[in-house]
């Protein structure tokens, strides 16, 4: 359940995350599985552990193998396994299947190609993008943050796309490349004004003080792939990131495509250790696309704990 394949090229940086994730405050120890030898945390080592991350700076073919990470969580030490394979660089242009990340599909309306695994690295824009080993040039191609946008997608745009970026670690630079296939689907989609499925307008959500609470903002935007669509939460009209309450975080849910073909998005608002003052806030679920913005407001109310396993009924 908690084993993950990771791969990279020799002489490039490779950063692997422990498949068994814990809270940021938890200690994570890394070991070579075969020898049970601890991986050092000192950054002067070529291979070192840094919390949930295992860093190969740079990687060598001999680094291939299974690595064990142990998350020192309360009650149990939880174990994960990272199966790492480092390959020799290919002399020709072909990228073998075993180096490919998951295929993504695009259409005329949505042609984003995300650079795989980039979130694990300390990189700075811009990314370099290649298609079938050729550097991409022309106004149709736009490198934006961690993805590539192709304007006016055509079937000829299908192919293997490689992103290349530099990882910086304590002033030293390491190259990283990642490749994935892009397919073009001819799709008769449409976009409409956002429809919020949950929460209901002016919904009252019952919560227990001291417990955790989740609010889901779910909206649909039309049929097929959407070029611009977003759902988010605001607190008293302020973005979650700007509100400055670490107990309250939003987390992207799964992209949903229902049997009727509607394209929908979820955003979960997680409130840890609900406090009295949280009941005074206004929670706004916002859904927006090119057509406009729709807002549904939720308020929290205290749930009177009628606990079936209370010792005093």
């Amino acid at each position: 359940k908690f084993s993950k394949q990771s791969w990279g090229l020799e002489n490039e940086a490779l950063i692997v995350r422990c498949p068994r994730q814990g809270k940021p405050s938890y200690t994570v120890d890394w070991y070579y599985s075969q020898t049970n030898k601890s991986i050092p945390t000192q950054e002067r080592n070529r291979v070192f552990a840094s919390g949930q991350l295992l860093k190969f700076l740079p990687a060598e073919v001999a680094d291939s193998g299974i690595y064990t990470c142990i998350v020192r969580s309360p009650t149990f030490n939880r174990t994960g396994y990272a199966n790492v394979t480092i390959y020799k660089k290919q002399s020709d242009c072909n990228v073998p299947d075993y180096l490919m990340y998951s295929t993504v599909s695009g259409s005329e309306k949505n042609s984003k190609i995300y650079c795989p695994t980039i979130d694990l690295y300390n990189w700075t824009a811009p990314l370099e993008w290649f298609k079938n080993c050729q550097a991409l040039q022309g106004s149709r191609y736009r490198a934006h943050k961690s993805f590539l946008v192709i304007d006016n997608v055509m079937t000829e745009d299908a192919g293997d796309y490689t992103c290349k970026f530099i990882h910086n670690e304590n002033g030293a630079n390491y190259s990283v490349t990642a490749t994935r296939s892009f397919t073009v689907k001819d799709e008769q989609g449409f976009s409409l004004f956002p429809v919020i499925g949950a929460p209901a307008q002016n919904e009252i959500k019952e919560v227990e003080i001291g417990k955790n609470a989740n609010l889901t903002c779910s909206a649909c935007f039309g049929k097929g792939t959407q070029f611009l669509a977003a759902v988010l939460w605001q607190l008293n009209g302020t973005k979650i990131t700007d509100f400055g309450e670490p107990r309250i975080q939003q987390e992207e849910g799964q992209n949903q495509s229902f049997s009727n073909g509607l394209a929908c998005l979820d955003m979960v608002l997680r409130i840890a250790d609900v406090k009295e003052e949280d009941l005074l806030l206004q929670y706004d679920c916002l859904a927006l696309n090119l057509h406009g913005l729709r807002r549904h407001t939720v308020r929290l109310s205290r749930k009177n704990p009628i606990d079936h396993h209370s010792i005093y009924c």
Epitope: F2, R20, K23, Y26, P74, T75, F76, R78, N212
Partner: antibody, heavy 122, light 111 residues
């Protein structure tokens, strides 16, 4: 209603085997760590085994190699296979819910079953 | 293994009076996340154990506010501000830092 119901206890001879079951309802069973805790007559509580959401298992030295905990998330069920039973294993066995192993939230061992009695005697 | 030691073994109480139970662990129960993994449970006669306090000082849902938990490191206390007749039973402390270990129990009975 959040509930745990144990079954499978009974009388067994020393060296024999027994399989306990625990049926969970009213919560998302698959995300929780689950425990077996036992209590010998007139004595205190002793932790017997645990299983986390990944299926990793944990045991104290007193039962390691003899007891096996397992879970079937599709059936919301927890099991304890007890082999090579000894007189000292005679106890009431409780199934109990631990922390949320997905979000790493811990609110104590907050749900307990009613217990099932295991008697090891010739 | 972490060893939990409870005292007293038996505690005769008078309804309306306060009572306290002590629990000591063989090592600190403070985790890197900042919480003390120490719980208190009450087992009433003929019943399953029931959670009173978790993470050292958090009252479980439905538990009266006359129950409170305190302490840090290796020393913890369960306080009952005014004992009621229904509070009789055996109280256990339990550490959940490294698997689970229970204290030996404190039997609370009415004088």
């Amino acid at each position: 209603e959040v509930q745990l119901v144990e079954s499978g206890g009974g009388l067994v001879q020393p060296g024999g085997s027994l399989r306990l079951s625990c049926a969970a309802s009213g919560f998302t069973f698959s995300t929780y760590d689950m425990h077996w805790v036992r209590q010998t007559t007139g004595k205190g509580l002793e932790w017997v085994s645990a299983i986390d959401l990944a299926g990793d298992t944990y045991y104290p030295g007193s039962v390691k190699g003899r007891f096996t905990i397992s879970r079937e998330d599709a059936k919301n069920s927890l099991y304890l296979q007890m082999n090579s039973l000894r007189a000292g294993d005679t106890a009431v066995y409780y199934c109990a819910r631990g922390g949320d192993g997905y979000n790493y939230d811990y609110y104590g061992i907050d749900v307990w079953g009613q217990g099932t009695t295991v008697t090891v005697s010739s | 293994d972490i060893v939990m030691t409870q005292s007293p073994l038996s505690l005769p109480v008078t309804p309306g009076e306060p009572a306290s139970i002590s629990c000591r662990s063989s090592q600190s129960l403070l985790h890197s996340d900042g919480y003390h993994y120490l719980d208190w449970y009450l087992q009433k006669p003929g019943q399953s154990p029931q959670l009173l306090i978790y993470l050292g000082s958090n009252r479980a849902s439905g538990v009266p506010d006359r129950f409170s938990g305190s302490g840090s490191g290796t020393d913890f206390t369960l306080n009952i501000s005014r004992v009621e007749a229904e509070d009789v039973g055996v109280y256990y402390c339990m550490q959940a830092l490294q698997t689970l270990t229970f204290g030996g129990g404190t039997k609370v009975e009415i004088k």
